[in-house]
Interface confidence: low
């Protein structure tokens, strides 16, 4: 469940974040899953752990495998898995599907292409951008911070875009490339008042004390790129990150899915080791966009285990 796919090219830097999040003060231990061997933290090693990050400087094909990270706090441990695959560099220009990051869509109004995973690296501007392996030239293309802006987007701008940058670690430089597809939307998008698909309003969810529980907040907002759209969970009117209960976590990130062409977002609330006091809380799934806010409230109730003696 708390597993993340990561990939890179041999002889490039690859930095992987532990899929389990914790406060900066928590310690994170990394292991190579197949051998249960601890990953060193000394920076002189080619592969080393640095808190929530696992660094391959540079990566080798033999590094491929599953890595375990354990986030340790005084009161709990959380385990995550990073499934790392390092590929050989392609001799031709074609970027295979397995090296592609998520596709982004653009329109005349909004044509930003973000460089995937760049936030994990210690890089300095400018980024280099390539389309179908050709360096981008001309005033229509502007490399701005961690993204590329294309002015006056046309359908011909669709294609595979690669960003290239340098990661610096203790004075040593390592190259990183990342590729994603860019599609151009012809049809006009629209936005609707948020529609929450789950949970139902005033839903009662049965949970077992001591077990884990998941609540999904899912809402759709219209068609095409949505601005100012978000789904989130609140506990007793407080944002999860402010509530301060480490057992209750919002799944990191929001997935923008397109079912029947609609732009939808999901946010999963994970409650570990359900306790009696969790039943007293009010769980609000909030969906917001530029039309307004919709709120669905969920309460938890105890699922009575079947008494086999009665």
């Amino acid at each position: 469940k708390f597993s993340k796919q990561s990939w890179g090219l041999e002889n490039e830097a690859l930095i992987v974040r532990c899929p389990r999040q914790g406060k900066p003060s928590y310690t994170v231990d990394w292991y190579y899953s197949q051998t249960n061997k601890s990953i060193p933290t000394q920076e002189r090693n080619r592969v080393f752990a640095s808190g929530q990050l696992l660094k391959f400087l540079p990566a080798a094909v033999a590094d491929s495998g599953i890595y375990t990270c354990i986030v340790r706090s005084p009161t709990f441990n959380r385990t995550g898995y990073a499934n790392v695959t390092i590929y050989k560099k392609q001799s031709d220009c074609n970027v295979p599907d397995y090296l592609m990051y998520s596709t982004v869509s653009g329109s005349e109004k909004n044509s930003k292409i973000y460089c995937p995973t760049i936030d994990l690296y210690n890089w300095t501007a400018p980024l280099e951008w390539f389309k179908n392996c050709q360096a981008l030239q001309g005033s229509r293309y502007r490399a701005h911070k961690s993204f590329l802006v294309i002015d006056n987007v046309m359908t011909e701008d669709a294609g595979d875009y690669t960003c290239k940058f340098i990661h610096n670690e203790n004075g040593a430089n390592y190259s990183v490339t990342a590729t994603r597809s860019f599609t151009v939307k012809d049809e006009q998008g629209f936005s609707l008042f948020p529609v929450i698909g789950a949970p139902a309003q005033n839903e009662i969810k049965e949970v077992e004390i001591g077990k884990n529980a998941n609540l999904t907040c899912s809402a759709c907002f219209g068609k095409g790129t949505q601005f100012l759209a978000a789904v989130l969970w609140q506990l007793n009117g407080t944002k999860i990150t402010d509530f301060g209960e480490p057992r209750i976590q919002q799944e990191e990130g929001q997935n923008q899915s397109f079912s029947n062409g609609l732009a939808c977002l999901d946010m999963v609330l994970r409650i570990a080791d359900v306790k009696e006091e969790d039943l007293l809380l009010q769980y609000d799934c909030l969906a917001l966009n530029l039309h307004g806010l919709r709120r669905h409230t969920v309460r938890l109730s105890r699922k009575n285990p079947i008494d086999h003696h009665s």
């Epitope: 944002k239 990150t241 806010l293 709120r295």
Partner: antibody, heavy 116, light 107 residues
Framework: QVQLVQSGAEVKKPGASVKVSCKAS????????MHWVRQAPGQGLEWMGI????????SYAQKFQGRVTMTRDTSTSTVYMELSSLRSEDTAVYYC?????????WGQGTLVTVSS | DIQMTQSPSSLSASVGDRVTITCRAS??????LNWYQQKPGKAPKLLIY???SLQSGVPSRFSGSGSGTDFTLTISSLQPEDFATYYC?????????FGGGTKVEIK
Amino acid sequence: QVQLVQSGAEVKKPGASVKVSCKASGNTFTAYYMHWVRQAPGQGLEWMGIINPSGGSTSYAQKFQGRVTMTRDTSTSTVYMELSSLRSEDTAVYYCARGVGATNYWGQGTLVTVSS
Amino acid sequence: DIQMTQSPSSLSASVGDRVTITCRASQGISNNLNWYQQKPGKAPKLLIYAASSLQSGVPSRFSGSGSGTDFTLTISSLQPEDFATYYCQQGFNFPLTFGGGTKVEIK
């Protein structure tokens, strides 16, 4: 402890512009929507608009459309509200407030006086 | 835009009194209604969100009820520090709109 600290009072002439800042501290800046609300002397509260600090997208009340611009600077965790073509009826205390449907943290307010 | 009508616009009451303020929306807003308290020279303070949920740190003498178009804020036993202006606000639709306010004064 979450705090929203606004810039100081301003006196402006009719037709001028004013830019009010609101610096957030104590939590992840981009995780919260920021609203701007104003209150004319002795009057009620009036919502002006909202900005998503994460992407910078905005939604403005129709009344202020074309006159108001809300921006943010993620490097300093600051949001800005600029109101142009000021008139005497824009004299008010301007508040930034954080939240989604309900705003549970407010700045201390910035008094903007428009007078010739 | 959704109009919010608050009543009364002002009221006089004594410490210990039960006080009720009503707010009506021009169209259904589900439970997306919030109540704020404001004292002179200060920023508003959130009391109740989602019509009936008490904001953390707010005394339990404050309560909210209602759904759809009609909402009520009740102060079960008025305290000296409760003399202030109270505003309702709909959080259902942009633009967000506030009621005109209710000033609670000492009798």
